[in-house]
């Protein structure tokens, strides 16, 4: 277990021409607020999975009304960290989304209206218990500074917070096979207390006897990798005759969503569906009112007026989930043509188009011979997303400019000789064989296997193939 | 702008059938893939059928053999036919359209049509 930490620095105009608008004016006094979503693994950041690490909202910022003709400055930030606190292991590689809100205060009809000011994303590398990174985003005009850290929560230590620390039982020194906890180096590492077996790189324990594991994987030990198992009953008992794996308890036994909330099984873990009044990741986030900007994405927060009665967040299209924290999954009517692989970002869909396609939505079948010539009177051939170039005889190689060998494949049978010539190849046959390769033999009578030798040339005269 | 418009909607019994109908209005626009989203009350909303970019339709297995996609190009309109309706059938349907603008793509959303499968 631990917490995620992250630091607002600034928030303000990025460098270079087009400084953005202000987002507050003396009309429309407004203040900022940041919401910061985890994700594990290096995911694409814009897929728009449950933010399974966790997130977290800031405090309000001081309000701020712009100065008449000023540039916008960077802006008053809210006081301290933005804390996402993390259950289990710490992944080491993580995705994260930093969304900058804006609230307005002026005189809107049923209170305060949020409107998202800008949105980063990146992936990153992060072992627990290490110094602060320092980090830089722009996002259009705006650019945001901040700082990040993970670190373990004691008694767990580690990179991955899965090491335990326990106090030392003797003053000098720890146990046997036993290490001093850095940097708690008047701590010593608690012995291995998971259960027998349980797998070093895929399991963690947090009690003794206990083996939990880490995301895609199962089993008791957390051998067994998650997958569409092939067997009739999904939790029914191991065949050993189809060498079924049965993955251990699904990520919804027990029902880990708190509060009233449904579990549905994913590919990967599980979600929660929240009642209203409740979210995080297991629904354990309550007590929540609309001036605790719960809707996201620009959804709209009706009721809620106190922490005793439920708000209803309105979404805007494409967004769903009790806080419009999930994107409809548009990518599921496969926009993208030609086998083109689709990424929904959010504001736009995006298409990675294979070889030899191009277009927003791969729908231009690139021309492969388009502005390509083939040398030395090639010719161009177009196909399968490259283009490929028909070579005339004497020249190879991709775009016909290498002067080829024609004896570099040994054309000349039974021991004939081949010599380079400027229109091909000429083979000097070994006694007994003629032809343009030396291929028919010549009979022991003087006939040969051909009707008749050309004109002018007798068997063992070099051949030109033409 | 785009506009799609959805009817259709209403309420049968299990074993029963709807014809909805989805039509896209605009100047200028052409529809690169469109099809039938539905949400049931407190579930997440999930394509249920659709045209490709490529053309090819496209169906939610839990409707397969039971629904069928149509369109009609002159119109610009698409059609999905639910026989052998069941109680978790029931859902607003969304018709969802990518659509070409321009020289730009752009989503647009129905406000959608509600399908009730009751006894």
């Known amino acids: 277990a631990g917490v995620f930490e992250l630091q607002i620095h600034s928030f303000g105009p990025g460098p270079g021409p087009g400084a953005p608008r202000s987002p507050c004016s003396a009309r429309l006094p407004c203040r900022l607020f940041f919401r910061v979503c985890l994700k594990p693994g290096l995911s694409e950041e814009a897929a728009e999975s449950p933010c399974a690490l966790g997130a977290a909202l800031s405090a309000r910022g001081p309000v701020y009304t712009e100065q008449p003709g000023a540039p916008a400055p960077d802006l008053p930030l809210p006081d301290g960290l933005l804390q996402v606190p993390f259950r289990d292991a710490w992944p080491g590689t993580f995705s994260f989304i930093i969304e900058t809100w804006r609230e307005e205060l002026g005189d809107q009809i049923g209170g305060p209206a949020w409107s998202l000011l800008a949105r980063v994303a990146g992936r990153r590398r992060l072992a627990a218990g290490g110094p602060w990174a320092r980090d830089i985003q722009r996002a259009g005009a705006w650019e945001l500074r901040f700082s990040y850290r993970a670190r373990c929560e004691p008694p767990a230590v580690g990179t991955a917070c899965t090491r335990l620390c326990r106090p030392r039982s003797a003053p000098s020194r720890c146990g046997p096979g036993l290490r001093p906890c850095a940097p708690l180096e008047d701590e010593c590492e608690a012995p291995l207390v998971c259960r027998a077996g349980c797998s070093p790189e895929h399991g963690f324990c947090e009690q003794p006897g206990e083996c939990r594991c880490l995301e895609g994987w199962t089993g008791p030990l957390c051998t067994v990798p998650v997958s569409t198992s092939s067997c009739l009953s999904p939790r029914g008992p191991s065949s050993a005759t189809t060498g079924c794996l049965v993955p251990g308890p699904g990520p919804c036994d027990g029902n880990p969503c708190a509060n009233g909330g449904s579990c549905s099984e994913t590919p990967r873990s599980f979600e929660c569906t929240c009642p209203r009044g409740f979210y995080g990741l297991r629904c354990e986030v309550s007590g929540v009112t609309c001036a605790d900007g719960p809707c996201f994405n620009g959804g709209l927060c009706v009721g809620g007026a106190d922490p005793d009665s439920a708000y209803i967040c309105h979404c805007p299209p494409g967004f769903q989930g009790s806080n419009c924290e999930k994107r409809v999954d548009r990518c599921s009517l496969q926009p993208c043509r030609n086998g083109g692989l689709c990424l929904d970002l959010g504001h736009a869909l995006r298409c990675r188009c294979r070889a030899g396609f191009a277009g927003p939505r791969c729908e231009h079948d690139l021309d492969d011979c388009a502005g390509r010539a083939c040398a030395n009177g090639g010719t161009c051939v177009e196909g399968g997303g490259a283009h490929r170039c028909s070579c005339a005889l004497g020249f190879g190689g991709r775009d016909c400019r290498e002067r080829a060998d024609p004896c570099a494949a040994r054309p000349c049978a039974h021991g004939g000789r081949c010599y380079a010539h400027f229109s091909g190849l000429v083979c000097a046959c070994a006694p007994g064989y003629m032809g343009a390769r030396c291929e028919f033999p010549v009979h022991p009578d003087g006939a040969s296997a051909l009707p008749a030798a050309p004109p002018g040339l007798r068997p063992g005269d070099p051949q030109r193939y033409l | 702008e785009v506009q799609l418009v959805e009817s259709g909607g209403g309420e049968v019994q299990p074993g029963g059938s709807l014809r909805l109908s989805c039509a896209a209005s605009g100047s200028d626009f052409s529809i690169n893939a469109i099809g039938w989203y539905r949400q049931a009350p407190g579930k997440q909303r999930d394509m249920v059928a659709g045209?490709?970019?490529?053309?090819?339709?496209t169906y939610a297995e839990s409707v397969k053999g039971r629904f069928t996609i149509s369109r009609d190009n002159a119109k610009n309109t698409v059609y999905l036919q639910m026989s052998s309706l069941r109680a978790e059938d029931t859902a607003v349907y969304y018709c969802a359209a990518d659509v070409k603008i321009g020289g730009d793509y752009e989503w647009f959303w129905g406000q959608g049509t509600l399908v009730t499968v009751k006894p």
């Open positions: 045209f490709t970019g490529d053309g090819v339709t």
